[in-house]
C-alpha cells in the first residue's frame, strides 16, 4: 500500500494571550494517482520561534477510515517517544514520552493534531504522524527547527573601530556593515545550540562618521548605527 506524506506551509497567528501560535498545516495541491492515493513522500523542515506554541497536523483522513493514529517524536539525545490512539478500543498509549509540553491538542478521536506548548530549544527534532488505514499508512513528517532571536549590541572599542554582536541566536545570525570596513567575524558555539556572532570593523577613511550594523536572522532583521568618535562611545543594545 502507498505511504503518502505531504508538504506543509507555516501559518502564524496571534492568540488572545501574548504567546504566538504556529500551525504547520495547510490545504495543499496533492500528487494523485490510481484510486486517488497520494504517493508523495515528503518530510518538511519548518522553523518555529522559541517560546511560541506549535501545532502539527496529520494528513486529512476521516476518523471513520482509521485504525490507529500514532505520533512518533525523535528529539536529540532522547529515546523515540510515541503517542498512539487505537480507534477500536478508544485507548491512548504513550511510550518513552517525558516532555509534558508535547500533547494531543484534544481527545485524539476528536482531533489528531499534536501541540507543543511554549517551544524550547530541546524541541528541535523530528515529528511524524502515522495514520494506519485498512489499505496502508499515511505519513506526515516534520523536521522542527527551533529559532532563537539573538540579542544585538553595537559599540566602539577603539579609535574608529566598532564591534557588533548577535548573542545566542539560533541559527547563527549574519552581520553586514554600511559602509563596508575592514572587518573580522568570529562565531562562538554554545552547548544549547545557540551561536554568538561577533563582527569587528575598522574604518581608516576619516570622512566616515556614522556606521550601521545590519543583523539578518530568520526571526527578523535589525539595524543599529553608531557615530565613530575619536574615543570609545556609548554602548547600544537591542533585541531583534
Amino acid at each position: 500500500a502507498a505511504q503518502p506524506n505531504n508538504s506543509l506551509m507555516l501559518q502564524t497567528s496571534k492568540e488572545n494571550h501574548a504567546l504566538a501560535s504556529s500551525s504547520l498545516c495547510m490545504d495543499e495541491k496533492q500528487i494523485t494517482q490510481n484510486y486517488s492515493k497520494v504517493l508523495a513522500e515528503v518530510n518538511t523542515s519548518w522553523p518555529v520561534k522559541m517560546a511560541t506554541n506549535a501545532v502539527l497536523c496529520c494528513p486529512p483522513i476521516a476518523l471513520r477510515n482509521l485504525i490507529i493514529i500514532t505520533w512518533e517524536i525523535i528529539l536529540r539525545g532522547q529515546p523515540s517517544c510515541t503517542k498512539a490512539y487505537k480507534k477500536e478500543t478508544n485507548e491512548t498509549k504513550e511510550t518513552n514520552c517525558t516532555d509534558e509540553r508535547i500533547t494531543w491538542v484534544s481527545r485524539p478521536d476528536q482531533n489528531s493534531d499534536l501541540q507543543i506548548r511554549t517551544v524550547a530549544i530541546t524541541h528541535d527534532g523530528y515529528y511524524r504522524c502515522i495514520m494506519v488505514t485498512p489499505d496502508g499508512n499515511f505519513h506526515r513528517g516534520y523536521h522542527l527547527q527551533v529559532l532563537v532571536t539573538p540579542e544585538v549590541t553595537l559599540f566602539q572599542n577603539r579609535n574608529r573601530t566598532a564591534v557588533c554582536k548577535a548573542v545566542a541566536g539560533k541559527p547563527a545570525a549574519h552581520i553586514s556593515w554600511i559602509p563596508e570596513g575592514d572587518c573580522a567575524t568570529k562565531q562562538e558555539y554554545w552547548s544549547n545550540g545557540t551561536v554568538t556572532v561577533k563582527s569587528t570593523c575598522h574604518w581608516e577613511v576619516h570622512n566616515v562618521s556614522t556606521v550601521t550594523c545590519h543583523v539578518s536572522h530568520l526571526t527578523g532583521n535589525k539595524s543599529l548605527y553608531i557615530e565613530l568618535l575619536p574615543v570609545p562611545g556609548a554602548k547600544k543594545s537591542a533585541k531583534l
Epitope: P4, C25, D27, Q30, R64, S112, P134, F138
Partner: antibody
C-alpha cells in the same frame, strides 16, 4: 480499475421495502467506506448514510434512521441498502459512492438505481 | 448538522466567459488547516463526478479550467473559460462531520 455496479431498477408499492445492491471491484473491498445518496426527480443529492466494510460500522442520516439498513457481504464484495416503509416521496435514483481516504472525497460512484414507489 | 447554501440557483454563461458558484456553510468545515469541501459536476442521467476536493485541489483528469477556493464557511467554484459541454448541475459537499450537499446550481451555456 475501481468500479461500482448497482442492481437494476425497481418498482415498489407504498409500505413495501427495497434492497439495492452495489458490487465493488478493482480494489480491496473491505478497505473503503461506502456511502449511499439519493436523488429525487429534478432534485438535488441527499446523503443517506455509510457503511464501513472493514468493521461493519454504519452511520445513518437522522432522516432515515429506523427505515434504512446498510449491510455488506465480503464474499461477494457487495454492499446493500435496504429502505423500508416506502412512500411515494422515496421515488428517486439511489447511488453508492466510495470514499477515498485523502480528504474523505468520493471519487467513484455507481451508475445509480431508479426506485419507483407507486400504487 | 452543517447546512450548505449554494448560489445562484441557476446561471447562464456564454462560452469563453467565467462562471462562479458560491457555497456557504452554516458553520466552519475547516479543521487542522484543511477545508473539507468538495465540488461535483452532474450531467443528466449520470452520477456526480468529483471536480475539486479539499476546497482547492483539482481531481486527477479534471481540466484546469475548474478551480476552487475558500476556507472556513465561504467557498467558490470557478469555471474559466466556460465551454459548451460544461452544461450541468454543480454541487458542493462537505465531509467535516456527517456529509451533506448544497442544493445545487444549474449552469447553462448560452
Amino acid at each position: 480499475q475501481v468500479q461500482l455496479v448497482q442492481s437494476g431498477a425497481e418498482v415498489k408499492k407504498p409500505g413495501a421495502s427495497v434492497k439495492v445492491s452495489c458490487k465493488a471491484s478493482g480494489y480491496t473491498f473491505t478497505s473503503y467506506v461506502m456511502h449511499w445518496v439519493r436523488q429525487a426527480p429534478g432534485q438535488g443529492l441527499e446523503w443517506m448514510g455509510y457503511i464501513n466494510p472493514y468493521n461493519d460500522d454504519t452511520n445513518y442520516n437522522e432522516k432515515f434512521k429506523g427505515r434504512v439498513t446498510m449491510t455488506r457481504d465480503t464474499s461477494t464484495s457487495t454492499v446493500y441498502m435496504e429502505l423500508s416503509s416506502l412512500r411515494s416521496e422515496d421515488t428517486a435514483v439511489y447511488y453508492c459512492a466510495r470514499e477515498d481516504y485523502y480528504g474523505s472525497r468520493w471519487g467513484t460512484w455507481g451508475q445509480g438505481t431508479l426506485v419507483t414507489v407507486s400504487s | 448538522d452543517i447546512v450548505l447554501t449554494q448560489s445562484p440557483a441557476s446561471l447562464a454563461v456564454s462560452p469563453g466567459q467565467r462562471a462562479t458558484i458560491t457555497c456557504r456553510a452554516s458553520k466552519s468545515v475547516s479543521t487542522s488547516g484543511y477545508s473539507y469541501m468538495h465540488w461535483y459536476q452532474q450531467k443528466p442521467g449520470q452520477p456526480p463526478k468529483l471536480l475539486i476536493y479539499l476546497a482547492s485541489n483539482l481531481e486527477s483528469g479534471v481540466p484546469a479550467r475548474f478551480s476552487g477556493s475558500g476556507s472556513g464557511t465561504d467557498f467558490t467554484l470557478t469555471i474559466n473559460p466556460v465551454e459548451a459541454n460544461d452544461t450541468a448541475n454543480y454541487y458542493c459537499q462537505h465531509s467535516r462531520e456527517l456529509d451533506t450537499f448544497g442544493q445545487g446550481t444549474k449552469v447553462e451555456i448560452k
